[in-house]
């Protein structure tokens, strides 16, 4: 069964800046990745970025840079300032859509005890 992993890290240099990394452990080819915060995309979450392997990347504030790391993993940097900036207990979710298997998603947040720069 495919699985999704999520890592959330606070940047040491900018304490309100986050990096989210997500990956898909499965055999199918990825068709779309959706990154959201505040919960899963279908359950009240707000979309931060949508990554398509052919048609490119769409992102919305406070997302600053979304990119593919490999064919099955992505990373997203969030801007730390402003009213819409994330806080330490924000939940981030990644949903990987693979054709024709379907979709798998997982969520993660910054571990309560983590220091800046420590990955989840």
């Amino acid at each position: 069964t495919p699985e999704v992993w999520v890592q959330v890290r606070m940047e040491a240099t900018e304490l309100s800046s986050f990096t989210i990394r997500c990956g898909f452990l499965g055999s199918g080819s990825i068709s779309l990745v959706t990154v959201s915060w505040g919960g899963p995309n279908g359950a009240g979450g707000t979309t931060l970025a949508v990554l398509h392997p052919e048609r490119g990347i769409r992102q919305w504030a406070p997302a600053r840079q979304a990119r593919w790391e490999t064919q099955s993993s992505i990373s997203l940097i969030l801007e730390g300032s402003g009213a819409s900036s994330p806080c330490a207990n924000t939940t981030f979710c990644c949903k990987f859509a693979s054709f024709p298997e379907g979709s798998w998603e997982a969520c993660g947040s910054l571990p309560p005890s983590s220091d800046p720069g420590l990955s989840a």
């Epitope: 068709s31 899963p40 052919e54 859509a97 054709f99 024709p100």
Partner: antibody, heavy 120, light 107 residues
Framework: EVQLVESGGGLVQPGGSLRLSCAAS????????MSWVRQAPGKGLELVAA????????YYPDTVKGRFTISRDDAENSLYLQMNSLRAEDTAVYYC?????????????WGQGTLVTVSS | DIVMTQSPDSLAVSLGERATINCKAS??????VAWYQQKPGQPPKLLIY???HRFTGVPDRFSGSGSGTDFTLTISSLQAEDVAVYFC?????????FGQGTKLEIK
């Protein structure tokens, strides 16, 4: 304008074979996942075959697995369904459909369908 | 397999009145739910995707809602051209499945 035009349906005896074709136009065929969906007379919809845009991944339900084969020819903008060992319960209108990644794999375009009748 | 169960099987509504069709999934399907409209002798047409997003050209009297396992298609003010069979569909997990259909008629 997106167009999908099916052909190849007809009357065939039980145990026989048919090859359905779907001619696509009005979009970049190679960028889309495609499927065949059938509808028996007066009944609901059943997805019987799906193929990823790169052609590497296919899907068949147990009802047709081992008897049906989906394929595509991107140079010809065509989708095919090879149907062998046909049974009376395969009688249906067969639709070619296009999946949109950005719509959660919803089928945003359908052909008019081609009728397959399996009877002695 | 995820079973999509629609209710009711058939529905008669007066012109201008609200029509509501429900779809229940046997397990959570996230937001990967679509609704299709099929008129006699025609292929299905996409109405709603991602639970609540209207497809291009679909009148705003059609709306979708729900989450998890329970979803609803609403036609706020029934028009004569809305007479059709409506299907819900999940593309969350293979095998992708459809509801059995709801036949909508004018009372």
């Amino acid at each position: 304008e997106v167009q999908l035009v099916e052909s190849g349906g007809g009357l065939v005896q039980p145990g026989g074979s048919l090859r359905l074709s779907c001619a696509a136009s009005g979009f970049t065929f190679s960028s889309y996942h495609m499927s065949w969906v059938r509808q028996a007379p007066g009944k609901g919809l059943e997805l019987v075959a799906a193929i990823s845009r790169d052609g590497d991944s296919t899907y068949y339900p147990d009802t047709v697995k081992g008897r049906f084969t989906i394929s595509r020819d991107d140079a010809e903008n065509s989708l095919y369904l090879q149907m062998n060992s046909l049974r009376a319960e395969d009688t249906a209108v067969y639709y070619c459909s296009r999946h949109e990644d950005y719509f959660g794999f919803a089928m945003d375009s359908w052909g008019q369908g081609t009728l397959v009748t399996v009877s002695s | 397999d995820i079973v999509m169960t629609q209710s009711p099987d058939s529905l008669a509504v007066s012109l201008g009145e609200r029509a509501t069709i429900n779809c229940k999934a046997s397990q959570s399907v996230s937001n990967d739910v679509a609704w299709y409209q099929q008129k006699p002798g025609q292929p299905p047409k996409l109405l709603i995707y991602y639970v609540s997003h209207r497809f291009t050209g679909v009148p705003d009297r059609f709306s979708g809602s729900g989450s998890g396992t329970d979803f609803t298609l609403t036609i706020s003010s029934l028009q004569a051209e809305d007479v059709a069979v409506y299907f819900c569909h999940q593309a969350y997990r293979s095998p992708w499945t459809f509801g059995q259909g709801t036949k909508l008629e004018i009372k």
